[in-house]
Structure formats: structure tokens, C-alpha cells
């Protein structure tokens, strides 16, 4: 197993709709044609697999049906996107790639990217 | 649809070459690696190696290296597998299949109908 | 590489009952696991991936489960159609490799 660098941005807001956007970065050093991207969350030191996805360079991502990611790839970049997020899910969300073909394998993971996620303030009823 | 078309059985002397041909069609060819398998009488499955067709790189097992080759032809959609020095422990199906991915996992999704090898003297 | 292995090799079942085939990791391998099944002359048929997920098609009395080194295939009610022999497949690191199988056969 060798080491690889992987960026990532070190804070991202969540839309008003709980949508999280950003872009993991790697610093290939091979030519690779098969990656695997996985987002981890780190929480009160547990860690756990938010999603992941295998693709081939220059095919689209795709993630399995009930996973709250959706993302696309271009060169070395990774560009996640997360939904579906509340307050609760605030937190630091690490990106870990894997160049699993051709050999030899590789393995980066970037220092994670804190999310915030505030809860949008519930509309008070109105009368019409 | 996606579909992959093998060639008809062989019939081989020990110490031959035999070379099976997969033709591709109902995607975009070189979007997806194929994989070489074969299958031993009453045996379980064997890899043998993959192509990217894109750039026609290749892998293969350790234990086929040295006597296997795989190839490709972009204009016909078609790949080949070609084994050498053959010896009767060849004898089987051979198989090639598509990979595919589906959020963190591979697999084979589409194979071909499989080309007997026959090794005799 | 990774080792899988099966069990049991065979077994005889009725159409009917509840059929379950254990598939082992020589390494953790995660939920990177597939299922497989073949009939006599015929090459193989995705059942199951990424340990749990049901391949478009397959009817839902075939369900997957497990993680790390341990994974379990499960027939809820084998049908006559179901008379034939399953592999599983890591997909955690290259190469593949492919349990023994496990033959499935009237009783």
C-alpha cells in the first residue's frame, strides 16, 4: 500500500435545503483508471461510511440507490456533493481515495472538510 | 442491449494456441474494462486477467504470464484472449464478462456465453 | 490475494425452504462482496452486490448479508428454479477471486 495527498476544503456551510458541496483532490501518482472514493464522517471520535463509489476515469460516479451522495469526476478531482443533511449531521466528513487499478495500489486520505448544517427556522403560520 | 458474442468451441493439440474472440456491442466500448475467466470441468471460476480497452493496457494472473495475451480491436468492438503452449489442464470454459460498478463495488454484470476449449492429443 | 471460501460444497434442499450459504474472506474485504448464480452450461448470473444489494431482475427471496470476513446468501423459499450452484466474488482488492461454489440440488 502507498501513500498518495489528498485535498480538500477545511469548511463548508450547508445550504438552507442541506445540501453540502465540495471538491476532494488527488495527487495521482500513477496512471490510475479505477477509483475509489469513499466519505467518511468523524464525530465524537467515531467514524463512520457516509458513501462511496468505484469508477472508471472519465465514466460518472454512481453511487447506490438509497446513498444521500451524488458526485462527478474530472482529472484527479472529485467533485461531492452530500444532501439530505440536518443539524445533527454537522461534523468533519474526510475523503478517502483509492487508485485500485492498474497495481500497484494507493491510498490517500485528506484531512476532512467540517461541514456546518443549521436547521432552517420553521415558518410561523400565517393567516390569509 | 449490452451483449457479448464468443466464439464457437476449439478442438487444440497440446503445445498449441488457441486465440477466443469477444465482440462488444450495446455500449460504448472502451467505458468499461473486460475480464478473462475460465472454468475447469466441474471446477469453480478462474480469473485470468483484464484489458482496458481505452488504451488496450492489460493484467493478468500470475499464472498465465508468459503464455496468455489479450487484445483488442477498437474498429470491430472486439476483444481477444489468446493462450499458448496449451496442455490439457486448459481444458475449459473460457469466459469473457464486463465489469461494472455500482456505488463502492465491482461486478460482473454481463458475460459472454463462453467458448469451450478442448486440450487433446 | 484474498481467499473465499464456501460452504457447504452442496446441499440438498425441497422447493419450499429456506436455503443459506455462508461465504468466508481470508482478509476483511468491507461489504465488497457478490453473489452468483450458474446453471449447467451456462455462465454465470449476478445476484447480489456490494453484499446486500439485489441486482436488477433477481426476484427478492434471494437476500445478502454480512461484512468484513463473514457473508451469508439467502433463499427464502427455493423455487425449482433455483436448483444450481452459487459463487461469491470479493471485490475489495484486485485480483478477483471467487469462492469454490456451492451446489444447490433437489433433495
Known amino acids: 500500500c502507498k501513500a498518495m495527498h489528498v485535498a480538500q476544503p477545511a469548511v463548508v456551510l450547508a445550504s438552507s435545503r442541506g445540501i453540502a458541496s465540495f471538491v476532494c483532490e488527488y495527487a495521482s501518482p500513477g496512471k490510475a483508471t479505477e477509483v475509489r472514493v469513499t466519505v467518511l464522517r468523524q464525530a465524537d471520535s467515531q467514524v463512520t461510511e457516509v458513501c462511496a463509489a468505484t469508477y472508471m476515469m472519465g465514466n460518472e460516479l454512481t453511487f447506490l440507490d438509497d446513498s444521500i451522495c451524488t458526485g462527478t469526476s474530472s482529472g484527479n478531482q472529485v467533485n461531492l456533493t452530500i444532501q439530505g443533511l440536518r443539524a445533527m449531521d454537522t461534523g468533519l466528513y474526510i475523503c478517502k481515495v483509492e487508485l485500485m487499478y492498474p497495481p500497484p495500489y494507493y491510498l490517500g486520505i485528506g484531512n476532512g472538510t467540517q461541514i456546518y448544517v443549521i436547521d432552517p427556522e420553521p415558518c410561523p403560520d400565517s393567516d390569509f | 442491449q449490452v451483449q457479448l458474442v464468443q466464439s464457437g468451441a476449439e478442438v487444440k493439440k497440446p503445445g498449441a494456441s488457441v486465440k477466443v474472440s469477444c465482440e462488444a456491442s450495446g455500449y460504448t466500448f472502451t467505458n468499461y474494462y473486460i475480464h478473462w475467466l475460465r472454468q475447469a470441468p466441474g471446477q469453480g471460476l478462474e480469473w485470468m486477467g483484464i484489458i482496458n480497452p481505452s488504451g488496450g493496457s492489460t493484467t493478468y494472473a500470475q499464472k498465465f504470464q508468459g503464455r496468455i495475451t489479450m487484445t483488442r480491436d477498437t474498429s470491430t468492438n472486439t476483444l481477444y484472449m489468446e493462450l499458448s503452449s496449451l496442455r490439457s489442464e486448459d481444458t475449459a470454459i473460457y469466459y469473457c464478462?464486463?465489469?461494472?460498478?455500482?456505488?463502492?463495488?465491482?461486478?460482473?454484470?454481463?458475460w459472454g456465453q463462453g467458448t469451450t476449449v478442448t486440450v487433446s492429443s | 490475494d484474498i481467499v473465499m471460501t464456501q460452504s457447504p460444497s452442496s446441499l440438498s434442499a425441497s422447493v419450499g425452504d429456506r436455503v443459506t450459504i455462508t461465504c468466508r474472506a481470508s482478509?476483511?474485504?468491507?461489504?465488497?462482496l457478490n453473489w452468483y448464480q450458474q446453471k449447467p452450461g451456462k455462465a454465470p448470473k449476478l445476484l447480489i452486490y456490494?453484499?446486500?444489494s439485489l441486482q436488477s431482475g433477481v426476484p427478492p427471496r434471494f437476500s445478502g448479508s454480512g461484512s468484513g470476513t463473514e457473508f451469508t446468501l439467502t433463499i427464502s423459499s427455493l423455487q425449482p428454479e433455483d436448483f444450481a450452484t452459487y459463487y461469491c466474488?470479493?471485490?475489495?482488492?484486485?485480483?478477483?477471486?471467487f469462492g469454490q461454489g456451492t451446489k444447490v440440488d433437489i433433495k
Open positions: 464478462a464486463r465489469r461494472d460498478c455500482r456505488g463502492p463495488s465491482c461486478y460482473f454484470a454481463y
Open positions: 466474488q470479493q471485490a475489495n482488492s484486485f485480483p478477483p477471486t
Open positions: 482478509q476483511s474485504i468491507s461489504s465488497y
Open positions: 456490494a453484499a446486500s
